[in-house]
């Protein structure tokens, strides 16, 4: 299972993808939106 995280500490597992929080403006991924620090880095 994949991991979704918010900076606020929330996480769930869902689908075969990886999402987690990075500093906004990081060049490591795409901002998901409507989250706290949610960035796609897979």
């Amino acid at each position: 299972d994949a991991e979704f995280r918010h900076d606020s500490g929330y996480e769930v597992h869902h689908q075969k993808l990886v999402f987690f929080a990075e500093d906004v403006g990081s060049n490591k991924g795409a901002i998901i939106g409507l989250m706290v620090g949610g960035v796609v880095i897979a």
């Epitope: 500490g9 929330y10 869902h14 939106g33 409507l34 989250m35 706290v36």
Partner: antibody, heavy 121, light 111 residues
Framework: QVQLVQSGAEVKKPGASVKVSCKAS????????IHWVRQAPGQGLEWMGF????????NYNQKFKGRVTMTRDTSTSTVYMELSSLRSEDTAVYYC??????????????WGQGTLVTVSS | DIVMTQSPDSLAVSLGERATINCRAS??????????LNWYQQKPGQPPKLLIY???KQGTGVPDRFSGSGSGTDFTLTISSLQAEDVAVYYC?????????FGGGTKVEIK
């Protein structure tokens, strides 16, 4: 300024596929995920999923059970949403959208103008 | 999946009066003191527009007459003094979990 410009209206027969495009401009394309939301005539909003232009990774609403595919072309800053095995209930306006995160100090949303897809025999 | 339920389905309010729309989630959309609950306004023939995010924070350029409140599973959007340009359909949406989900919408009209 940020703009999302979608392709034009489509009429499809049941069982066919449709591919809607969303061309982004006014920002660094790979920085934000692009979401797709649809709205059947006179009905509410339904989130279909999103794709990351940075990596091409997508996350879909499982309601669509493998019928939806979201892709991107970084050379043209365009995201595509393809929906297959169309049925009459897929008749809707399809929107692409981009959202800021809560912690960016400002939170804005940007939407395409919508693409009407009509499924009719 | 989280189910969002709005009430009422429609609402007629006199100009200058208060309009109140309710939204209930089938489970909490809170985490660590943040409510992942957003409100949108949609006018006919237009895409939605984000009004309120994180339950209480105004989106960019949103007039002060729009405010949001609530936490956990119960939320409210208030228009403090209805203007003619506020005639629209309003939707709540949760962004705590995928799939994101919307309420069914509330149509606001002038009485």
């Amino acid at each position: 300024q940020v703009q999302l410009v979608q392709s034009g209206a489509e009429v499809k027969k049941p069982g066919a596929s449709v591919k809607v495009s969303c061309k982004a401009s006014g920002y660094t394309f790979t920085t934000y995920a692009i979401h797709w939301v649809r709205q059947a005539p006179g009905q509410g909003l339904e989130w279909m999923g999103f794709t990351s232009p940075y990596s091409g990774v997508s996350n879909y609403n499982q309601k669509f059970k493998g019928r939806v595919t979201m892709t991107r072309d970084t050379s043209t800053s365009t995201v595509y949403m393809e929906l297959s095995s169309l049925r009459s209930e897929d008749t809707a306006v399809y929107y692409c959208a981009r959202f800021d995160n809560y912690d960016q100090g400002y939170v804005r949303d940007y939407w395409g103008q919508g693409t009407l897809v009509t499924v009719s025999s | 999946d989280i189910v969002m339920t709005q009430s009422p389905d429609s609402l007629a309010v006199s100009l200058g009066e208060r309009a109140t729309i309710n939204c209930r989630a089938s489970e909490s959309v809170d985490n660590d003191r943040i409510s992942f609950l957003n409100w949108y306004q949609q006018k006919p023939g237009q895409p939605p527009k984000l009004l309120i995010y994180a339950a209480t924070k105004q989106g960019t350029g949103v007039p002060d007459r729009f405010s949001g409140s609530g936490s956990g599973t119960d939320f409210t959007l208030t228009i403090s003094s209805l203007q003619a340009e506020d005639v629209a359909v309003y939707y709540c949406q949760q962004s705590k979990e995928f799939p994101w989900s919307f309420g069914g919408g509330t149509k606001v009209e002038i009485k």
